[in-house]
Structures are given as C-alpha cells and as structure tokens.
C-alpha cells in the first residue's frame, strides 16, 4: 500500500513539475525590466526564451519573436536546449510511469517489469528536473552578469547634459516557476526510485523456512507461487534462517528475484 502511494505521489508530483517546466519554457517573463531607477515607467520590457515583449502603460503589449537562430547568444541557445531536453525526458518519463503504476493493470505484466519501468521513469524525472534547474540557473547567472555590467555603465552622457538610461533586466516569474517545477520533478523522480525498491520483490520481504528432504533442499516461500531448489545458480544445501540472511559469497541473481507473479 505504501509503495503504491509513494509511486502514485511521485507520479503526480512529477506531472505537476513537468507541467511547470513546460509553462516556464513557454512563458515570456524570463527577464523583466528592473524598475528600481524608474518605478513609473510608461514602457515595460520583458523577455522570454522565444520572444521579447513591450507592455505600454496604455495597455498595449507588443511581442516579437527571435526569428534568428545563429544571431542569438550561445547561452540562450543552451538554456533552450536544456529546457527542451527536460521536457522531452519528462514526457517520456510520464509515459513510462503510467504503465509502471501499480494501480494500473496491463495484461499480465510482471512486477519485475513494473519495477524496472518505475526506476527508468524515476531516473528520467530526476534528469528532467536537473535539466530544468540547470537551464534556469544558467539564465539567472546570465542575468546577474548582465545586470552588474549594465549598472557599471548605467548612464552615458554627452557633456553631462543628456542621459541615456540603459535598460537593466532582473529575474522574471518564469525563473521561479522553473526552479520550483524542476525541484518538483526531481522530488517526483526520487519518489519513483524509492517506490521501485518497494516494488522489487526482495527475499528479505519474506520469512522463509527450509524443509529438508533426503538429498536435496526445497525452500517453500510463503506468499510466492514458485518453489525452487535454492535461488538462481546457488544450488548449495544451505539453511535459510531469519528471513533469508545470506552469506557474502552467495550469488544474487536479480532476474530470479522477480520471477514470481
């Protein structure tokens, strides 16, 4: 029950996170005009990954796309790439995790397959979240650098008479959405990985008793449908005490761990 809850919660958190990453990527307010020097500006500038916008106090907003690809800063291209990779990985992760959910029955899919899929989607969510956090952080770093550079040459004058105020940009709402969304996707991914451990049928989950017949050992495992002579390639006569405590030299074969329904 706890495993299902953890898996379900991980899925929901990741879903919210990825939706947030998509929203952040599409948002225009990655950087917004700093109003510190002019809080009553009649023209407000803000920029996204795909276009820049100008909102006039009259109520009119005009947005222009970045129609050039080669003319854009390498950092912006890198941020775009990170965000897209994050979205793609997240979307694939969501698709995989839907089939991995314990509450959804698909044919005669074994728990081993579900465990593997849960782990795969968890890793995808973690990488997706990291991509988003990295992308947003790179952009934020770029903003901070440009902010202090433009502050250094804030006013350039002609004989001290005419002032040209350089527009400075600060963190926009999309950055915070991206950070939170990336964090949620990361947390969701971690939860999926934790759920995977619970889905995987470990021997330690069961108390096992060995009944010795003449010449060979047959281990009857309560809760399982299969009785086997030992586990995997381990055919040594060995008593299993205290829930299947094992010696270090014993071979663990993972496929056989998951071979019951």
């Amino acid at each position: 029950m706890a495993v299902t809850a953890c898996q379900g919660l991980g899925f929901v958190v990741s879903l919210i996170g990825i939706a947030g990453i998509i929203a952040a990527t599409c948002m225009d307010q990655w950087s917004t005009q700093d109003l510190y020097n002019n809080p009553v500006t009649a023209v407000f500038n803000y920029q996204g990954l795909w276009r820049s916008c100008v909102r006039e106090s009259s109520g009119f907003t005009e947005c222009r796309g970045y129609f050039t690809l080669l003319g854009l800063p390498a950092m912006l291209q890198a941020v775009r790439a990170l965000m897209i990779v994050g979205i793609v990985l997240g979307a694939i992760g969501l698709l995989v995790s839907i089939f991995a959910l314990k509450c959804i029955r698909i044919g005669s899919m074994e728990d081993s397959a579900k465990a593997n899929m849960t782990l795969t989607s968890g890793i995808m969510f973690i990488v997706s979240g990291l991509c988003a956090i990295a992308g947003v952080s790179v952009f934020a770093n770029m903003l901070v650098t440009n902010f202090w550079m433009s502050t250094a040459n804030m006013y350039t004058g002609m004989g001290g008479m005419v002032q040209t105020v350089q527009t400075r940009y600060t963190f926009g709402a999309a950055l915070f959405v991206g950070w939170v969304a990336g964090g949620l996707t990361l947390i969701g991914g971690v939860m999926m990985c934790i759920a995977c451990r619970g889905l995987a049928p470990e021997e330690t989950n069961y108390k096992a008793v060995s009944y010795h017949a003449s010449g060979h050992s047959v281990a009857y495992k309560p809760g399982g449908f299969k009785a086997s002579t030992g586990f995997g390639s381990n055919t040594k006569n060995k008593k299993i005490y205290d829930g299947g405590a094992r010696t270090e030299d014993e071979v663990q074969s993972y496929p056989s761990k998951h071979d019951y329904v």
Epitope: V40, N45, Q47, V54, S58, G59
Partner: antibody, heavy 118, light 113 residues
Framework: QVTLRESGPALVKPTQTLTLTCTFS????????MSWIRQPPGKALEWLAT????????YYLDSLKDRFTISRDISKNQVVLTVTNMDPADTATYFC???????????WGQGTTVTVSS | DIQMTQSPSTLSASVGDRVTITCKSS????????????LTWYQQKPGKAPKLLIY???TRESGVPSRFSGSGSGTEFTLTISSLQPDDFATYYC?????????FGGGTKVEIK
C-alpha cells in the same frame, strides 16, 4: 465612433474641491489608458494623470499628486478626476484623452474650462 | 523628469514652404526592448483639442496627410511639413511618452508670414 466628453463646474472657489467627469463611448475601457491634460490660458499643454487600461495603475504629475485623484467607473464608462484645494493657478481648460499605441493620446474630448476665483 | 525643449517657439512661413520643427529631450526616449522612440507630435488649433499627428517618433496616425513626417532618435527629433498648407497654421507640441510624467514641449506656433 469614439467620443469623449468632459463635464464639471465652470467656476470654482479657492480651497474647494473640483470633480471633473469624462464620459466616453465607442471603445472598451480595459483596452486603453485614460489621461487628463490641462492647458492654462495662452500656455502649453500639461499632463496631469493617467489610469492604465486595466485600471491597476495610476500615474500623477509629482507636484500635484497630493491633490489629484484619478478613478474610473466601468459601469458608467466614466473617468473621474478629483482636485482638492483648488487655487487660481489651476484655472485652465481640462481635457481628457484616450491613451493608445505608443502611449500617444489619439482621441481627445473638446475640453472644459475651469476658472478658480472667489 | 524628462524635459522637452522645442525650437523655434514661433515660426513664420508661407503656403508651400518646407517647415521643420525640432524637439530635444533631456533623456533618451529610445526603448531598447522594441527599438522604438516614445515621442509623439500633436497639432492644436485655437480653442480646439490637440490632434495626434505622429507617434513612435515617425509613425503617422491614420488620416494624417503624408506631408507630415517625423524623424530622429534618442534625444533629437524633428517634425517636417513638406509643403505647408493653409490648414497647417497651428501650434505643434512634442511629448515624451517614454517615462512618467508625460511631459510636453513648450510648443511651436506656425504662423503666416
């Protein structure tokens, strides 16, 4: 078509409060800013106040912002300018105008002349 | 506040003349976001409300004759009337639309020579 019409008292005594109303039609208020501008006799135009299209922001001339209040009444399609503590220096023709693209004022009312005298 | 200085304050011209009015601002009116200059030109006749001629320094308002043109960038702007018509004798104002307060220039009165 777009029309704007200012209304208010023609004569006001010093220290009194002036309330000017701009009634408009032909456009949706939420899409445009609305401004008040005045022109003392024989002098240049002077911008006084603006209320943004959404109504969230109001802007005033710094020297007069303590005395001026701009507000709107969406249901009546009106923008109201209230001026407290009127002074003879406030004698002017008051215009209301619609603020459009480029923050330019594309439509103006005919203006209302206000004289401040005891 | 941005100060707007217009010159000349009065201009005498004849019908058919090419007229140029200059407007200077104390700060740049060029917005880096869209590379547009937030300067507007108005025409006002005695006893009438001002009429919008040009916004964004060079964009002519619809219905305004093509003889009116605006140019300039940053802090220096000009309004040009290519061939003065009898209907053009009026006072012209430039206005800063970039930053509040939205200051007007002192005006240029174009009168018959």
């Amino acid at each position: 078509q777009v029309t704007l019409r200012e209304s208010g008292p023609a004569l006001v005594k010093p220290t009194q409060t002036l309330t000017l109303t701009c009634t408009f039609s032909g456009f949706t208020f939420s899409s445009y800013g609305m401004s008040w501008i005045r022109q003392p006799p024989g002098k240049a135009l002077e911008w006084l106040a603006t209320i943004s299209g959404g109504g969230s922001y109001t802007y005033y001339l710094d020297s007069l912002k303590d005395r001026f209040t701009i507000s709107r009444d969406i249901s009546k399609n009106q923008v109201v300018l209230t001026v407290t503590n009127m002074d003879p220096a406030d004698t002017a023709t008051y215009f209301c105008a619609r603020q459009s693209r480029g923050n330019a004022m594309d439509y103006w009312g005919q203006g209302t002349t206000v004289t401040v005298s005891s | 506040d941005i100060q707007m200085t217009q010159s000349p304050s009065t201009l005498s011209a004849s019908v058919g003349d090419r007229v140029t009015i200059t407007c200077k601002s104390s700060q740049s009116l060029l917005n880096s976001g869209n590379q547009k200059n937030y300067l507007t030109w108005y025409q006002q006749k005695p006893g009438k409300a001002p009429k919008l001629l040009i916004y964004w320094a060079s964009t002519r308002e619809s219905g305004v004759p093509s003889r009116f043109s605006g140019s300039g960038s940053g802090t220096e702007f000009t309004l040009t009337i290519s061939s003065l018509q009898p209907d053009d004798f009026a006072t012209y104002y430039c206005q800063n639309d970039y930053s509040y307060p939205l200051t007007f220039g002192g005006g240029t009165k174009v009168e018959i020579k």
